[in-house]
């Protein structure tokens, strides 16, 4: 396993309507063909996964159903949006690439976008 | 140019097992997914998985789990999909396509079902 | 899964017409991809990331859309365009096509 660097944004602060969108780039040593991402929450030092791809020569990443990701690639560059957020989802989110293919087998982990999430505040009632 | 050829048709008995294989030239194998479709007579189209060849990734389509099975011999350049306890409403025209963007597809292996 | 609702089902047309199709998708996608059959021959990509043409596909034909509302566009209808189109999306597993509209040329 060979270490790679990936860059992603320190902070992203999430719309009204709990959407997050991040870029992910990774310094590929070579022309990688099928590139795995994932993308982990942490929160009070636990890890947990969000989502994960796995694309190849497309521009459109493809995640399992019900998943809250979607995305996009161009070139080193992956484009993530995360959908659904609420305060309690707040955290650090840290972009892992692989790349899984041809080899050697690449590793890179980022430092982490920490989101911020504000619930928007319900409409006062109105009159009309 | 790029070019997928599948096996010719078939005819099998219910409860037997088939090998379909889509063989690709043209390009580089490991590039690529190979996407397998079924389409029923006068049906629509339905997305059975793909298997990344590098590597032997594989996503099915939960309707197909435990149906079908996806693999790659890269050495040959070809792809396989092998259908089991096979059934009537196996019997269908089966597609292999190349990439994300389903941009070649094979002609098409006609199945069919009959005891 | 995302189930694409394709509309209409059938539809004829004169050739110099326009036609239009339409693909909704249960919940939001990021692209839609639109492919061409004719009868006992293989889907061809017509339309890939909502709106760009494949390789070949003459500009009477064009996609838009956003979400989970898309549509494909003939502007001049030619009688070789009588086929079956299917919409697919890519954004989740597992991909998923709509149930196709078959395209009358009269």
């Known amino acids: 396993c060979k270490a790679m660097h990936v860059a992603q944004p320190a902070v992203v602060l999430a719309s009204s309507r709990g959407i997050a969108s991040f870029v992910c780039e990774y310094a590929s040593p070579g022309k990688a063909t099928e590139v795995r991402v994932t993308v982990l929450r942490q929160a009070d030092s636990q890890v947990t996964e969000v989502c994960a791809a796995t694309y190849m020569m497309g521009n459109e990443l493809t995640f399992l159903d019900d998943s809250i990701c979607t995305g996009t690639s161009s070139g080193n560059q992956v484009n993530l949006t995360i959908q659904g957020l609420r305060a309690m989802d707040t955290g650090l989110y840290i972009c892992k690439v692989e790349l899984m293919y041809p080899p050697p087998y690449y590793l890179g982990i980022g430092n982490g976008t920490q989101i911020y999430v504000i619930d928007p505040e319900p409409c006062p009632d109105s009159d009309f | 140019q790029v070019h997928l050829q599948q096996s010719g048709d078939v005819l099998v008995k219910p409860g037997a097992s088939v090998n379909l294989s889509c063989k690709a030239s043209g390009y580089t194998f490991t590039s690529y997914w190979i996407n397998w479709i079924k389409q029923r007579p006068g049906q629509g189209l339905e997305w059975?998985?793909?298997?990344?060849?590098?590597?032997?990734?594989?996503y099915y389509n939960e309707m197909f789990t435990g149906k079908a099975t996806l693999t790659v011999v890269t050495s040959s350049t070809t792809a396989y999909i092998h259908l089991n306890s096979l059934s009537f409403e196996d019997s269908a025209v089966y597609f292999c396509?190349?990439?994300?963007?389903?941009?070649?597809w094979d002609q098409g292996t006609t199945l069919t079902v009959s005891s | 899964q995302i189930v694409l609702t394709q509309s209409p089902a059938i539809m004829s047309a004169s050739p110099g017409g326009k036609v239009t199709i339409t693909c909704s998708a249960s919940k939001s996608v990021s692209y839609i991809h639109w492919f061409q059959q004719k009868p006992g021959t293989s889907p061809k990509l017509l339309i890939y990331?909502?709106?760009t043409l494949a390789s070949g596909v003459p500009a009477r034909f064009s996609g838009s859309g956003s979400g989970p509302s898309y549509s494909l566009t003939i502007s001049r209808v030619e009688a070789e365009d009588a086929a079956t189109y299917y919409c697919q999306q890519r954004t989740t597993y597992p991909l998923t096509f709509g149930g196709g509209t078959k395209l009358e040329v009269r």
């Open positions: 059975i998985g793909r298997i990344a060849p590098g590597s032997g990734t594989t």
């Open positions: 990331d909502t709106s």
């Open positions: 396509a190349r990439g994300d963007y389903f941009d070649y």
